[in-house]
């Protein structure tokens, strides 16, 4: 808390400029009008104030706006944003994406701070959903943003926002997160033609069910092995040898190198050896010829 002292003669600030960096903390408090500061916030960022001086400027704004700053001030906070507490930010009503971008820029390249997390939370709640433009902005600043959200939070992402998602934004998502995102992507891209659709849906396929993989196998998509290895094991197991061959196209040869790894390993164990032999890859471990396969899970479901 800065003591209230009278401003020395001739030191009253007429505008926010470089001369203020020579003011002591008490002089800033006494000689800078809070309303002037609020209208000229855009200048503060260009002036090399010390952290202590920024504390005084924040204090002046807090006194002027005890209920929270207006957006016109928030948008131009610049480095003063780093001085804000989550409690300060909870008082704000940020509706403009430009304001959000301006404040994210201040924190760029650094881990998400409590201030930024609070700001994003306030912004998204204010909009009612994580819309496309917001998601676009957030993933530009924080590439791992989507994959750091819980499945419950991801379920509030509307399908239209999926257009903003780049493959690299999903690189580190786990299967549970992809289970939530895949149906949204399927809905978002449903009107695209075969090859274009596959390019868009490919990074979401870790959440795809068996029936969708079967459908893709009829479309000459030539899925690469890296994508195949990320598919849900339970979705791959019911696929026939012919379906996997169609799904992978020329990449089917890559199965040999992955035969000891999931989901390939588990899939091989479910196939007839005769069928596997038709691939000519030397895959071993299938069901020997003449053996009867009982699906006990189906039997349990019927009883």
């Amino acid at each position: 808390e800065v003591e209230k002292t009278a401003c020395p003669s001739g030191k009253k600030a007429r505008e926010i400029d470089e001369s203020l960096i020579f003011y002591k903390k008490w002089e800033l408090e006494a000689c800078v009008d809070a309303a002037l500061l609020a209208t000229q916030m855009d200048r503060v960022n260009a002036i090399p104030f010390t952290y202590e001086q920024l504390d005084v400027l924040k204090h002046k704004l807090d006194e002027l706006y005890p209920q929270g700053y207006p957006e016109s001030v928030i948008q131009h906070l610049g480095y003063l944003f780093l001085k804000m507490s989550p409690e300060d930010i909870r008082k704000w009503n940020v509706t403009s994406l430009e304001t959000l971008k301006a404040l994210l820029e201040v924190n760029k390249g650094h881990e998400m701070s409590p201030q930024v997390a609070t700001l994003i939370d306030r912004f998204v709640k204010g909009r009612g959903q994580l819309d496309k433009d917001t998601l676009d902005t957030l993933t530009a600043f924080y590439p791992g943003y989507l994959c750091s959200l819980s499945p419950e939070e991801l379920s509030s992402v509307p399908p239209s926002s999926i257009w903003a998602v780049r493959p690299q934004d999903l690189d580190t998502c786990d299967p549970r997160q992809l289970d939530v995102l895949y149906p949204k992507a399927r809905l978002a891209f449903q009107n695209m033609n075969g090859s274009e659709y596959f390019v868009k849906i490919q990074s979401f396929l870790g959440g795809a069910p068996t029936e969708d993989l079967k459908a893709l196998s009829q479309q000459n998509v030539s899925m690469d092995l890296a994508t195949f290895m990320k598919l849900r094991t339970d979705a791959v197991l019911p696929l026939t040898v012919a379906e996997v061959q169609k799904l992978l196209g020329p990449h089917v040869e890559g199965l040999k190198a992955e035969e000891r790894h999931r989901p390939v390993r588990d899939w091989i164990l479910r196939q007839r050896q005769d069928d596997l032999d038709t691939l000519g890859l030397g895959l071993q471990g299938g069901i020997p010829n003449g053996y009867l396969v009982l699906d006990l899970s189906m039997q349990e479901a019927l009883s």
Epitope: P143, S148, L149, S150, P151, E152
Partner: nanobody, 116 residues
Amino acid sequence: EVQVVESGGGLVQPGGSLRLSCGVSGSILALNTMRWYRQTPGNQREWVASIYSSGGSTGYADSVKGRFIISRDSAKNMMSLQMNSLKSEDTAVYYCNVQTPLNVYWGQGTQVTVSS
């Protein structure tokens, strides 16, 4: 600088239990997902389980569902994996993974060997 350290690995008999811990030092903040992955002797890294920042909801790979339990203490930046009814196929190096909006941090791993 964020550091992730796993502990608790070891040799255990089939059917036995083990508890792995993961500690995170440095500032990573509230919004993060913590995961366990494992790398088998055949060199495949596979996802095991996740615990999410919001509400502490969890997710498990089918191969460990019902046997493993993931939990976290956000105040201490700690996560653990309680592994029960261990099988020989659970033998692997177990890695802790911390996903923030900006980065992914990995630990060095802890070896779990299930053998009689």
